[in-house]
């Protein structure tokens, strides 16, 4: 393969009503279970069917959640950040981040996704 | 809906390796960890090491420096590269399957274990 991968990364506001089981997603990460090295962030690692996410469709696995009702959640314990989201009311506001892969030609072409220069 | 199926376990001497691999079928989802924990006659379940599917590992300090824990995401399945193994090694190894928290109404870990396998260092 003599293609590069790239990653276009954009946010977005999720305004999610808590269902009877809950916001209906999952989530690993933390300052002390690190997902990706040197990244304490909080990433969505399953969606559940018929949830409040996954009825939403907005939200995808992988996702990055930068904050919940306006609370950062950077460099938090995971089970602080569990608990952020067990006290964040009914209706929740996440900031995501969503990380989309994206193939780029051979490599040397500089597409428009390269950050260098 | 997950199944994890251990091998690689034994008996062997002090100071030897083995190596343990776990496979992975189901639904595991591309966003988990994968690892090997261990309980030793009479004592509690212990984390060995763990890595996930973003690239992180982490090690009990037990083994730091003696084990080596791999993954292919492709084959969905975890490694756990064991040397310079001593007595005190000695358990059941098993591995897990963590798919994260689930934010729901139990707020419980969303995880799978496989049956086990027995390491023995004499």
């Known amino acids: 393969m003599n293609g590069r991968v790239d990653y276009l990364v954009t946010e977005e506001e999720i305004n999610l009503t808590r269902g009877p089981s809950g916001l209906g997603f999952n989530i690993v990460g933390g300052t002390d279970q690190q997902y990706v090295s040197n990244d304490s962030g909080i990433y969505v690692s399953r969606i559940k069917e018929n949830g409040a996410a996954a009825l939403d469709g907005r939200l995808q696995e992988g996702d990055k959640i930068l904050s919940v009702n306006g609370q950062d959640l950077k460099n938090l314990l995971h089970q602080d950040a569990v608990d952020l989201f067990r006290n964040a009311g009914y209706a929740v506001s996440l900031r995501v981040q969503h990380r989309l892969q994206v193939q780029n030609g051979p490599i040397g072409h500089r597409g428009e996704g390269d950050p260098s220069g | 809906e997950v199944q994890l199926v251990e091998s690689g376990g034994g008996l062997v001497q002090a100071g030897g390796s083995l190596r343990l691999s776990c496979a992975a079928s189901g639904s595991i989802g591309s966003i988990n960890i994968m690892g090997w924990y261990r309980q030793a006659p009479g004592k509690q379940r212990e984390l060995v090491a763990s890595?996930?599917?973003?690239?992180?590992?982490n090690y009990a300090d037990s083994v730091k420096g003696r084990f080596t824990i791999s993954r292919d995401n492709a084959k969905n399945a975890v490694y756990l590269q064991m040397n310079s193994l001593k007595p005190e090694d000695t358990a059941v190894y098993y591995c897990n399957l963590d798919r994260g928290t689930h934010l729901g109404d139990s707020f419980e870990r969303d995880d799978y274990w496989g049956r086990g396998t027995q390491v023995t260092v004499s």
């Open positions: 890595i996930t599917s973003g690239g992180a590992t």
